[in-house]
Interface confidence: medium
């Protein structure tokens, strides 16, 4: 029955980019500007998303597909389909309710978004710290002292991973 009904329905012949216009004897009319239909057989066209304010147009609306937005410089997308724009911070910072704040000692963020994460604990893997961590970079772990045969390495064990003059917050 469904198959028979769809064959008799003139609207089923209307392709994407058009709508079945009841006011014009159900002929297929093109979607008007700023609207689209992504599937065939639709009785209305959907209004295109408008990228306003902090949103900017990444992909313009066509008669068969909606517009896509991203965020203006200094912001980044959050949520499905970039439903929100969140402020960027600098590397070494994270966004809080009071704005961008430096990462606490012992944490880092190497991106303009997201939260500060703890430095890797090299000793958990039986390794030593090869390069100290910073607010922007994780520590680099080196081979464990046992892996180094005497006199086979010129690596000097680094000082404790702490930035000079950077007190815990």
């Amino acid at each position: 029955f469904e198959r028979t009904r769809s064959l008799q329905d003139p609207c089923s012949n209307c392709p994407a980019g058009t709508f079945c216009d009841n006011n014009r004897n159900q002929i297929c009319s093109p979607c008007p500007p700023n609207s689209f239909s992504s599937a065939g057989g639709q009785r209305t066209c959907d209004i295109c998303r408008q990228c306003k304010g902090v949103f900017r147009t990444r992909k313009e609306c066509s008669s068969t597909s909606n517009a896509e937005c991203d965020c203006t410089p200094g912001f980044h997308c959050l949520g499905a389909g970039c439903s929100m724009c969140e402020q960027d911070c600098k590397q070494g910072q994270e966004l809080t309710k009071k704005g961008c704040k430096d990462c606490c000692f012992g944490t880092f963020n190497d991106q303009k978004r997201g939260i500060c994460r703890p430095w890797t604990n090299c000793s958990l893997d039986g390794k030593s710290v090869l390069v100290n961590g910073t607010k922007e970079r994780d520590v680099v772990c080196g081979p464990s002292p046992a892996d180094l045969s005497p006199g086979a390495s010129s690596v000097t064990p680094p000082a404790p991973a702490r930035e000079p003059g950077h007190s815990p917050q």
């Epitope: 500007p33 609306c61 068969t64 597909s65 896509e68």
Partner: antibody, heavy 116, light 107 residues
Framework: QVQLQQPGAELVKPGASVKLSCKAS????????INWVKQRPGQALEWIGN????????NYNGNFKSKATLTVDRSSSTAYMHLSSLTSKDSAVYYC?????????WGQGTTLTVSS | DILLTQSPAILSVSPGERVSFSCRAS??????IHWYHQRTNGSPRLLIK???ESISGIPSRFSGSGSGTDFTLSINSVESEDFADYYC?????????FGSGTKLEIK
């Protein structure tokens, strides 16, 4: 930065046809409409039509439907407008412009002269 | 087709003055109007979109207002670089149409 590059001038004979080009750069070509606009000397702007390079959707001003054909070459990010059966009335500056509704970037325009 | 009527054809002002351009549509087009200026031998440049929305890089002295059939572009203090032709354009329905233009000249 966004740029639309057009040849400066074209000279063709009456009755002939011409294919005007508009090379886009600085953005994703398939994501934005390209419009074509005519301006005769001392006259107002006249919208010819537009094309969506992502799927070749086109819309035309009825006055130009038998005159202009819009196409794109995605591999070179270039939009084209083919004008046929040229007469002196087709002598004008032809601009390409990016935008679905408001036209935010424009080429420098191609001056088309139809003369024997 | 939607007809856009711009008036007057020519506006004469002195630098520093405030000036307003009018654009009237032949039918209700909501806020689907955009404003451009075009300097001599140059390409048009988008100034305002959707009647009142500002454009990045355009000086704040340019503003727009209106909805329905009557629209206005204003320059709150004209500078020498503003002397040019001004056009409105509608995107409510195809074909898009432009107004006949208003020439802003130095008094």
């Amino acid at each position: 930065q966004v740029q639309l590059q057009q040849p400066g001038a074209e000279l063709v004979k009456p009755g002939a046809s011409v294919k005007l080009s508009c090379k886009a750069s600085g953005y994703t070509f398939t994501n934005f409409w390209i419009n074509w606009v005519k301006q005769r000397p001392g006259q107002a702007l006249e919208w010819i039509g537009n094309i969506y390079p992502g799927n070749d959707n086109t819309n035309y001003n009825g006055n130009f439907k038998s005159k202009a054909t819009l196409t794109v070459d995605r591999s070179s990010s270039t939009a084209y407008m083919h004008l046929s059966s040229l007469t002196s009335k087709d002598s004008a500056v032809y601009y390409c412009a990016r935008g679905q509704l408001g036209l935010d970037y424009w080429g420098q325009g191609t001056t088309l002269t139809v003369s024997s | 087709d939607i007809l856009l009527t711009q008036s007057p054809a020519i506006l004469s002002v002195s630098p520093g003055e405030r000036v307003s351009f009018s654009c009237r549509a032949s039918q209700n087009i909501g806020t689907a109007i955009h404003w451009y200026h075009q300097r001599t031998n140059g390409s048009p440049r988008l100034l305002i979109k959707f009647a009142s929305e500002s454009i990045s890089g355009i000086p704040s002295r340019f503003s727009g207002s209106g909805s329905g059939t009557d629209f206005t572009l204003s320059i709150n203090s004209v500078e020498s670089e503003d002397f040019a032709d001004y056009y409105c354009q509608q995107s409510n329905s195809w074909p898009f149409t432009f107004g006949s233009g208003t020439k802003l000249e130095i008094k």
